[in-house]
């Protein structure tokens, strides 16, 4: 988790002098509770936006927006703590809006936005906005939270972001797999425009089961420049096991931008359809 560009972040708006500060996610009001605290944010909304860095890179960011309730507690509102928690790693990043002037009611509802938290493809986040100071112990909560999931690099709009392109999202191998005679699979895919090696991972399964009955790895050396964007054809020999008929072929590239953590592509061959054969009728009837 990080902030997009560490240029001056702005939270001031007409009628409010405000500054954005790094936060430890542990506001002082936890330790030194105040008697009078503001009410919670209203209408918290989290959206996925895309933003360019000063270097021209494109990143997905969490666009956070909320409004204030129209009650007298805004007189005690000193700022807000914005927290983003990545759910699978428990990593948290916070910033603090520090109000340098007192808020007053005006003809429009106060609205705040922040779009500088960079988020990762295929990750889920909990976004919380806490009004400051935080409430006394047992006081009514004055925060609002929402979870949101970022699409993965297969998504059309995500595909062109810098983190996705770095992991090889623009490569479309267009994998085809066909079953040949004599327990063989023919795998064909399009090479990318980089002199890097590939690995084909074959995993076979019995019909309708998820534990593998055969695994095989095949190394493909780095292509020469004249082979870029050409089709690579590989024939894999299968283990002669009856019923080990569903094959998943996964191609792992080793591009320089992502090394051994590049996006993998896969294709699956289903088991052949079994004709419905009627149960044979016994020509004698057992007596027991």
């Amino acid at each position: 988790l990080r902030l997009l560009d560490h240029r001056a972040l702005v939270c001031s708006q007409p009628g409010l002098n405000c500054t954005v500060k790094n936060s430890t996610c542990l506001d002082d009001s936890w330790i030194h509770p105040r008697n009078l605290t503001p009410s919670s944010p209203k209408d918290l909304q989290i959206q996925l936006h895309f933003a360019h860095t000063q270097q021209g890179d494109l990143f997905p960011v969490a666009h956070i927006e909320w409004t204030l309730q129209t009650d007298a507690s805004i007189l005690y509102l000193e700022g807000a703590e914005l927290s983003v928690l990545q759910l699978n790693t428990n990593e948290r990043l916070c910033v603090r809006f520090e109000f340098l002037s007192k808020l007053r009611h005006h003809h429009r509802r106060w609205r705040f936005t922040f779009s500088h938290f960079v988020v990762d493809p295929d990750q889920e986040y909990e976004v919380t906005v806490h009004h400051l100071p935080k409430p006394i112990p047992d006081g009514d909560p004055n925060h609002q939270s929402k979870n949101f999931l970022v699409p993965d690099c297969e998504h059309a709009r995500m595909k062109v972001t810098t983190p996705c392109m770095s992991s090889g999202s623009l490569w479309d191998p267009n994998i085809t797999v066909e079953t040949l005679e004599a327990h063989q699979l023919r795998v064909s895919f399009t090479l990318w425009n980089e002199s890097t090696h590939y690995q084909i991972l074959l995993t076979s399964f019995p019909h309708m089961e998820n534990h593998s009955c055969f695994e095989h790895m095949h190394h493909i050396p780095a292509p020469r420049p004249e082979e870029f964007h050409q089709r690579s054809n590989v024939t894999l020999t299968l283990r002669n096991l009856k019923g080990c008929c569903r094959h998943q072929v996964q191609i792992q590239p080793f591009f320089s931008s992502c090394l051994n953590d590049c996006l993998r592509h896969s294709a699956t061959v289903s088991c052949p359809e079994m004709p419905d054969t009627p149960e044979p009728i016994p020509d004698y009837m057992p007596l027991w």
Partner: nanobody, 127 residues
Framework: QVQLVESGGGLVQPGRSLRLSCAAS????????MHWVRQAPGKSLEWVSG????????DYADSVKGRFTISRDNAKNSLYLQMNSLRAEDTALYYC????????????????????WGQGTMVTVSS
């Protein structure tokens, strides 16, 4: 123009099944997460289920978990809700809704994250 049209509602006996459909047009359907929301007579809106753009993530309200299944067919620009073991308390107007942005609201009150709603299809569960 951007439009969502629900169908498949009707009168059904308790314990029976129904399949709702939602046809989308006017936007790139497979870019967005979609949701089902319902409103029982005299009650407020209740989120029912959500599905991410590629069906990789599906979520359900506790009240329908194990009975309802959400699915989508991006090739047909369609969203579905398979409702099994229907109960009287499932009686409501069912709406499909599109998320405003490309993310997927996976918890918290999500209704304000939707920008396009259908006109709804009525489901009545009664013997």
């Amino acid at each position: 123009q951007v439009q969502l049209v629900e169908s498949g509602g009707g009168l059904v006996q308790p314990g029976r099944s129904l399949r709702l459909s939602c046809a989308a047009s006017g936007f790139t359907f497979d870019d967005y997460a979609m949701h089902w929301v319902r409103q029982a007579p005299g009650k407020s809106l209740e989120w029912v289920s959500g599905i991410s753009w590629n069906s990789g993530r599906k979520d359900y309200a506790d009240s329908v978990k194990g009975r309802f299944t959400i699915s989508r067919d991006n090739a047909k620009n369609s969203l579905y809700l398979q409702m099994n073991s229907l109960r009287a308390e499932d009686t409501a107007l069912y709406y499909c809704a599109k998320e405003k942005s490309l993310g997927y609201c996976s918890s918290g009150p999500c209704s304000d994250a939707f920008d396009i709603w259908g006109q709804g299809t009525m489901v009545t569960v009664s013997s």
